[in-house]
């Protein structure tokens, strides 16, 4: 991390543009020139964390599945009594089969009725949802995509005309600073422009603004 960035973090007011020291700083400064640079997580650590999260998720899913199995078992044990065939004669077994078949038929009837109710409810929900959309004037939410964008472009997009003033003010501040540190920055020139050019930000910015 560049020394200037840690100083900037301690400053209450906007810090001056840092002196060119390390090329790895550029992208960070281009996107967040006045914020403290966050420490980067190494790829191996990222992978480790991802694996850990996946493991936790897997364990959670397994636990949920186990809970569901247990719940199903409990439900079945209350609904389906164990077969107590010891000592029952052929007559009783036949009778029992008839009883169980009758029970199955009854459960099937109940299941059919419940399915009919569910279907009716689904249809009603669909109708009501449609009515809600009709009342909203058939408004459709746009699908949001992640866009890589510079802070300035974002400001411009969010604030519109007011952002222009903010940008001009920033440019003015830079000019004042430039006079103070002209020697140091002569080689660098306008570092923001350089970075925008390097990262293709200028083109993106124009596209975004248009």
């Amino acid at each position: 991390m560049a020394d200037g960035s840690s100083d900037a973090a301690r400053e209450p007011r906007p810090a001056p543009a840092p002196i060119r020291r390390r090329s790895s700083n550029y992208r960070a400064y281009a996107t967040e020139p006045h914020a403290k640079k966050k420490s980067k997580i190494s790829a191996s650590r990222k992978l480790q964390l991802k694996t850990l999260l996946l493991q936790i998720a897997k364990q959670e899913l397994e636990r949920e599945a186990e809970e569901r199995r247990g719940e199903k078992g409990r439900a079945l044990s209350t609904r389906c009594q164990p077969l107590e065939l010891a000592g029952l004669g052929f007559a009783e077994l036949q009778d029992l089969c008839r009883q169980l078949h009758a029970r199955v038929d009854k459960v099937d009837e109940e299941r059919y009725d419940i399915e009919a109710k569910v279907t009716k409810n689904i249809t009603e929900i669909a109708d009501l949802t449609q009515k809600i959309f009709d009342l909203r004037g058939k408004f459709k939410r746009p699908t949001l995509r992640r866009v890589r964008i510079s802070a300035d472009a974002m400001m411009q997009a969010l604030l519109g005309a007011r952002a222009k003033e903010s940008l001009d003010l920033r440019a003015h501040l830079k000019q004042v600073k430039k006079e103070d540190t002209e020697k140091e920055n002569r080689e660098v020139g306008d570092w923001r422009k350089n970075i925008d050019a390097l990262s293709g930000m200028e083109g993106r910015k124009k596209k975004f603004e248009s």
């Epitope: 107590e84 010891a86 000592g87 004669g89 052929f90 007559a91 009783e92």
Partner: antibody, heavy 120, light 113 residues
Framework: EVKLEESGGGLVKPGGTLKLSCAAS????????MSWVRQTPEKRLDWVAT????????FYPDSVKGRFTISRDNARNTLYLQMNSLRSEDTAMYYC?????????????WGQGTLVTVSA | DIVMTQSPSSLAMSVGQKVTMSCKSS????????????LAWYQQKPGQSPKLLVY???TRESGVPKRFKGKGKGTKFTLTISSVQAEDLADYFC?????????FGAGTKLELK
């Protein structure tokens, strides 16, 4: 030695209720299906009710269905017969009987019986 | 319901004689899957409770003397006492264990001459 001992019989008026008990010993009560069988004064034998080893399955003839209830308490090794809305034709000697082993058939053991008299 | 018909209703025999009693069912008691006939025979001596003699139409219960022999299949069954003894004086009932309601025959009374 298998022993079945009925109790609870007596004289009751038509429409009355009575609860018979059968205390079992000499075998693993909870492993066997049990039944009540009655014998009329004319010596005719009538099957009254059957209950499975754990009490989940119950069987009755139409003549007593809805009036009589068979139950068991495996912890106490006792079989019960709750008799409601008694009629004069229910007058009989009531026997509790243990079913045979699963690979066999018939009522292997019978108690000495308890007499139920339904009369005004 | 399966109706069980026993005959004769009573018979008088002398000790040592052979006796045969009959039991007919209104429908077959044969379970085709195991080829077993679900019929039992019981003996009830005066003042006592019934005692199982034979099950599956021909299988003697343990402890039952060999003189008692059950036969038959389908709807026709017999119980034969090869040599009647004084202690055999009793009522004999057949019972079907094929379907509910379980039903008994009216019985055959064995008396001694």
């Amino acid at each position: 030695e298998v022993k079945l001992e009925e109790s609870g019989g007596g004289l009751v008026k038509p429409g009355g209720t009575l609860k018979l008990s059968c205390a079992a010993s000499g075998f693993t009560f909870s492993s066997y299906a049990m039944s009540w069988v009655r014998q009329t004064p004319e010596k005719r034998l009538d099957w009254v009710a059957t209950i499975s080893s754990g009490g989940s399955y119950i069987f009755y003839p139409d003549s007593v269905k809805g009036r009589f209830t068979i139950s068991r308490d495996n912890a106490r090794n006792t079989l019960y017969l709750q008799m409601n809305s008694l009629r004069s034709e229910d007058t009989a000697m009531y026997y509790c009987a243990r079913h045979h082993n699963p690979d066999k058939s018939g009522f292997a053991y019978w108690g000495q019986g308890t007499l139920v008299t339904v009369s005004a | 319901d399966i109706v069980m018909t026993q005959s004769p209703s009573s018979l008088a025999m002398s000790v040592g004689q052979k006796v045969t009693m009959s039991c007919k069912s209104s429908q077959s008691l044969l379970n085709s899957s195991n080829q077993k006939n679900y019929l039992a025979w019981y003996q009830q001596k005066p003042g006592q409770s019934p005692k199982l003699l034979v099950y599956f139409a021909s299988t003697r219960e343990s402890g039952v003397p060999k003189r008692f022999k059950g036969k038959g299949k389908g709807t026709k069954f017999t119980l034969t006492i090869s040599s009647v003894q004084a202690e055999d004086l009793a009522d004999y009932f057949c019972q079907q264990h094929y379907s509910t309601p379980l039903t008994f025959g009216a019985g055959t009374k064995l008396e001694l001459k």
